[in-house]
Interface confidence: low
Amino acid sequence: MGNSCYNIVATLLLVLNFERTRSLQDPCSNCPAGTFCDNNRNQICSPCPPNSFSSAGGQRTCDICRQCKGVFRTRKECSSTSNAECDCTPGFHCLGAGCSMCEQDCKQGQELTKKGCKDCCFGTFNDQKRGICRPWTNCSLDGKSVLVNGTKERDVVCGPSPADLSPGASSVTPPAPAREPGHSPQIISFFLALTSTALLFLLFFLTLRFSVVKRGRKKLLYIFKQPFMRPVQTTQEEDGCSCRFPEEEEGGCEL
């Protein structure tokens, strides 16, 4: 016990001695944040001048405060120990690390181009004030039907197909990732769905018979409680179309 106590004291003395030696060698290391080591005044710690800061100790100069001018506005004032932080004036949003740029907001249903805000083309949407127009989800690619039509501001809402009408299934599914438009004929899709539903029900009742016989009533209730759904991704693809499809004939776009 005494030995370990001695070790601690010795270590502390070593550290303190090292710090003292270091400060004797480099008096600037004593200068705290908010000050700088002034070489013109025998390395005295001088406070940072107005509109400058030092966020760490031992600095030989203070950094100039960032000025939030023009389209930038001050989110946090500069202090002697930390830089100012800017955001953008209303109607603009930040871009880049530390809000290095301000980009113009557009309305929902629009995207920003070099010539300003432009409406999303037919078949695309933007539900934010920033970013680009993205294609509507193609429900048929997931075997679903369109429950609610898309607009310039909103994606389509995919509704159930006959195959989704099994017990416990959710009736409206979030859109899957946006994909290129498909052209599968609706009638073929419908009959395929109908056939697969019939087969599913057949398999389902066969399974039930064996379940009742083998595992009893508890297991049967458990099967009924499970929704027959596969996981659906809800993330949208980041980039989508811009108003530049030669085949588009809808109004409101600059082609």
């Epitope: 000025q67 530390g98 070099k114 693809e237 980039d239 530049r244 082609l255």
Partner: antibody
């Protein structure tokens, strides 16, 4: 009319550094980004990095990170590109270019180019 | 990084020809694409931005189309002044990258 005027040709030894300037006139210097793009003899264009002069935020391509420093002097409307530890493969024409829409954008105005030759 | 591949590398054509240059991106870049013209010893010149918007002062015989990964620059009727090298550039994501260039030469 926006103009970007670059400094003259340079001949450098391997291992040394070069600093190229790009002076802008005829526009609000602070409100757009200045990028540096290089072109080796008979080769294509390669983006090196850029700066937003309004407060000096620079952005570099990974390939040049640690070897290139891009700065801007608002008082003289001049951007600078310094490339260190030069090697023979850095022999190229270095262009400054302006983009006004966003940081990553098309370049609507270009400097005339500065030829940097690295040779022992 | 997003790779930009131009084809063809060299194109021989005559004055009055309709010329098409293709640029393919290794991943979708929406419409964030520009086309430049460069003549020997000169800086590149912006022709098209946002895939299809014509830069002011550029003749209307130049046009751009495409979205996603496939883009095209078309010169409807090639003029003597159009013999040059053409580059595409994506500015969808960091770092912005250029195609290797297409040289349009006299047949």
């Amino acid at each position: 009319q926006v103009q970007l005027v670059q400094s003259g040709a340079e001949v450098k030894k391997p291992g040394s550094s070069v600093k190229v300037s790009c002076k802008a006139s005829g526009g609000t210097f602070s409100s757009y980004a200045i990028s540096w793009v290089r072109q080796a003899p008979g080769q294509g264009l390669e983006w090196m990095g850029g700066i937003i002069p309004i407060f000096g935020t620079a952005n570099y391509a990974q390939k040049f990170q640690g070897r290139v420093t891009i700065t801007a002097d608002k008082s003289t409307s001049t951007a600078y590109m310094e490339l260190s530890s030069l090697r023979s493969e850095d022999t190229a024409v270095y262009y400054c270019a302006r983009s006004e829409f966003r940081f990553y954008a098309d370049f609507d105005y270009w400097g005339q180019g500065t030829t940097v030759t690295v040779s022992s | 990084d997003i790779q930009m591949t131009q084809s063809p590398s060299t194109l021989s054509a005559s004055v009055g020809d309709r010329v098409t240059i293709t640029c393919r991106a290794s991943q979708s870049i929406s419409s964030w694409l520009a086309w430049y013209q460069q003549k020997p010893g000169k800086a590149p010149k912006l022709l098209i931005y946002d895939a299809s918007s014509l830069e002011s002062g550029v003749p209307s015989r130049f046009s751009g189309s495409g979205s996603g990964t496939e883009f095209t620059l078309t010169i409807s009727s090639l003029q003597p002044d159009d013999f040059a090298t053409y580059y595409c550039q994506q500015y969808h994501s960091y770092p912005q990258t250029f195609g290797q260039g297409t040289k349009v030469e006299i047949k």
